[in-house]
C-alpha cells in the first residue's frame, strides 16, 4: 500500500524533516504550511490547526515562501539620478537603477544605492575603457593618427581622415581638413571599432612642447605621469 | 595627385644607384612623408626609408637600410634614394609612397600611422655581373 | 625587430564565397595596421587602415577588424576582380620598432 499522505499540521517522523514549502514550528511541534510570495503568516499553526496566510499591504512584499508575521517594506523610490527597473509589487521588492550616462558607485543586494555621472572624456581624449552598470568610464589620451574632438562619455579616438590634399593636419583633438578633392575615408559598414588597451607606446604623459622639427608636425616630449581624470570633465 | 619613379638600371654589384621620385599635383613639402619600398621579384613588400618632406626633414630607416641607403628631397617636387654597394640581393622593383602627417605627440623619432595612401608604378633595379 | 606574420599564404575562393586572412604582429601595435590590395604589375593600394577604416572606393565587403596582436582582414561576397596578393602592415616606427609588412596572401578566385 502507498504511504498515506500527511496533511498539514503533522508530526514528523523522528529525526525526520518537513517537506518543500512547509516549516516546523517549534511551539506546535508540527510540520505546518508556509506562505506563498505576496503573502505572510496572519496566524501561526497549531497542534490541530494549519498556518492561516494573508496578502501582503501596499508598499510591504515578500519574495519567497515564507512564514514572516509581516510583510517586508519595499525600499524608498527612486531618486533622480535612478529608474524603477522593478516596481514595488506584493511579491517584489522595487530596484531602481542608474539612468542613461550614469554608473552605480555604491551597490545594495538588489539595485544601487548611489548613482554617479559617467566620466566624459575631452577633446584630445576618447574612451579607452566604456562605463558599466558598475564602473566609470576610462579615459585615454588619443594616440598619434588619431583624434577625438567631442566631450564624450562613449567617443573614441579615430584615425585622421587620409586626404588627397591636407590642408591642416590632424592632431589628437582635430582631424586631418582635406582641400576640396574628397577625404579617403570610409568607416567599414559592420566594424565595430572596440576601444583598445593602451599599448605602452600610446600611453602617452602629459606633453610639453619641444622645439618644433620641421612644420606641421609639432612633436612633444613628455614629462611625467597625467593625474587619474586626466581627459575628463567634471560634469 | 600621382608619383614616379625613375633612375631603375641594371648595374654591377658593389657599384652606386640614385632613384627619383618625382611628385605632381601636389607639393612634398605640404605635410607629408616620402618613403621607399621595395619588392623583389616574386616576393613580398620590404620598407627601406621615409623623410619627412620639408627642408631638412627628419629621415628614418629600416635597420638594415642604415649606411648604404640614403633618402633626401631635392625640390619641391622631388626626393631621391640614394644605394651604395649594391649586390644582388638588392635586385627589386623600387616603389616611392608616401605617408600624411599630423601633429604628434609622444617622443621626439616616433612615427605613427605610417599609412602609405599613394604610391608610384615602381622602377626596376637589377643588380648582376 | 616586430615581425608580422601572415596566414595563409595562399588561399582559393569561388565567387560570392568569403575569404579570412589574418596577420599576427610579434607584440601589441595598438590598431595602427593597414591592409594592402596588389595586382601583378602594380603598386599595392591602400584598402583598410587604423584595422577597421576603409579607404575611400573600397567596396564594403572589405572589413578590417582585431585588436593587440592579432588582425583579420575579410572578403565577403568575392569578386573576381578581388583576385590579387593582399599584404598587412605595421604602420608605427620608432627606435626598436619597424614598420614591417606581412608576407602576403595570394587570393585566387574560382
Known amino acids: 500500500l502507498p504511504a498515506q499522505v500527511a496533511f498539514t499540521p503533522y508530526a514528523p517522523e523522528p529525526g525526520g524533516t518537513c517537506r518543500l514549502r512547509e516549516y516546523y514550528d517549534q511551539t506546535a511541534q508540527m510540520c505546518c504550511s508556509k506562505c506563498p510570495p505576496g503573502q505572510h503568516a496572519k496566524v501561526f499553526c497549531t497542534k490541530t490547526s494549519d498556518t492561516v496566510c494573508d496578502s501582503c499591504e501596499d508598499s510591504t512584499y515578500t519574495q519567497l515562501w515564507n512564514w514572516v508575521p509581516e510583510c517586508l517594506s519595499c525600499g524608498s523610490r527612486c531618486s533622480s539620478d535612478q529608474v524603477e527597473t522593478q516596481a514595488c509589487t506584493r511579491e517584489q521588492n522595487r530596484i531602481c537603477t542608474c539612468r542613461p550616462g550614469w554608473y552605480c558607485a555604491l551597490s545594495k543586494q538588489e539595485g544601487c544605492r548611489l548613482c554617479a555621472q559617467l566620466r566624459k572624456c575631452r577633446p584630445g581624449f576618447g574612451v579607452a575603457r566604456p562605463g558599466t552598470e558598475t564602473s566609470d568610464v576610462v579615459c585615454k589620451p588619443c594616440a598619434p593618427g588619431t583624434f577625438s574632438n567631442t566631450t564624450s562619455s562613449t567617443d573614441i579616438c579615430r584615425p585622421h581622415q587620409i586626404c588627397h590634399v591636407v590642408a591642416i593636419p590632424g592632431n589628437a583633438s582635430m582631424d586631418a581638413v582635406c582641400t576640396s578633392t574628397s577625404p579617403t575615408r570610409s568607416m567599414a559598414p559592420g566594424a565595430v571599432h572596440l576601444p583598445q588597451p593602451v599599448s605602452t607606446r600610446s600611453q602617452h604623459t602629459q606633453p610639453t612642447p619641444a622645439p618644433s622639427t620641421a612644420p606641421g608636425t609639432s612633436f612633444l616630449l613628455p614629462v611625467g605621469p597625467s593625474p587619474p581624470a586626466e581627459g575628463s570633465t567634471g560634469d | 595627385q600621382s608619383l614616379e619613379e625613375s633612375g631603375g638600371d641594371l648595374v654591377v654589384p658593389g657599384t652606386s644607384l640614385t632613384l627619383t621620385c618625382t611628385a605632381s599635383?601636389?607639393?612634398?613639402?605640404?605635410?607629408?612623408?616620402m618613403c621607399w619600398v621595395r619588392q623583389a621579384p616574386g616576393k613580398g613588400l620590404e620598407w627601406i626609408a621615409c623623410?619627412?618632406?620639408?627642408?631638412?626633414?627628419?629621415t628614418y630607416y629600416a635597420s638594415w637600410a642604415k649606411g648604404r641607403f640614403t633618402v633626401s628631397r631635392t625640390s619641391s617636387t622631388t626626393a631621391t634614394l640614394q644605394m651604395t654597394s649594391l649586390t644582388a640581393a638588392d635586385t627589386a622593383t623600387y616603389f616611392c609612397?608616401?605617408?600624411?602627417?599630423?601633429?604628434?605627440?609622444?617622443?621626439?623619432?616616433?612615427?605613427?600611422?605610417?599609412?602609405?595612401?599613394?604610391w608610384g608604378p615602381g622602377t626596376l633595379v637589377t643588380v648582376s655581373s | 625587430a616586430l615581425v608580422m606574420t601572415q596566414t595563409p599564404a595562399s588561399v582559393s575562393a569561388a565567387v560570392g564565397g568569403t575569404v579570412t586572412i589574418n596577420c599576427q604582429a610579434s607584440?601589441?601595435?595598438?590598431?595602427?595596421l593597414a591592409w594592402y590590395q596588389q595586382k601583378p604589375g602594380q603598386p599595392p593600394k591602400l584598402l583598410i587602415y587604423?584595422?577597421?577604416y576603409l579607404t575611400s572606393g573600397v567596396p564594403s565587403r572589405f572589413k578590417g577588424s582585431g585588436s593587440g596582436t592579432e588582425y583579420t582582414l575579410t572578403i565577403s561576397g568575392v569578386q573576381c576582380d578581388d583576385a590579387a596578393t593582399y599584404y598587412c602592415?605595421?604602420?608605427?616606427?620608432?627606435?626598436?620598432?619597424?614598420?614591417?609588412f606581412g608576407g602576403g596572401t595570394e587570393v585566387v578566385v574560382k
Open positions: 599635383g601636389f607639393d612634398l613639402s605640404s605635410f607629408y612623408y
Open positions: 609612397a608616401r605617408h600624411q602627417s599630423y601633429e604628434t605627440y609622444g617622443y621626439v623619432g616616433v612615427v605613427y600611422a605610417t599609412y602609405f595612401s599613394l
Open positions: 602592415q605595421s604602420a608605427f616606427y620608432s627606435n626598436n620598432t619597424e614598420t614591417a
Open positions: 587604423y584595422a577597421s
Open positions: 607584440e601589441d601595435i595598438d590598431s595602427y
Open positions: 623623410i619627412y618632406a620639408v627642408s631638412s626633414g627628419s
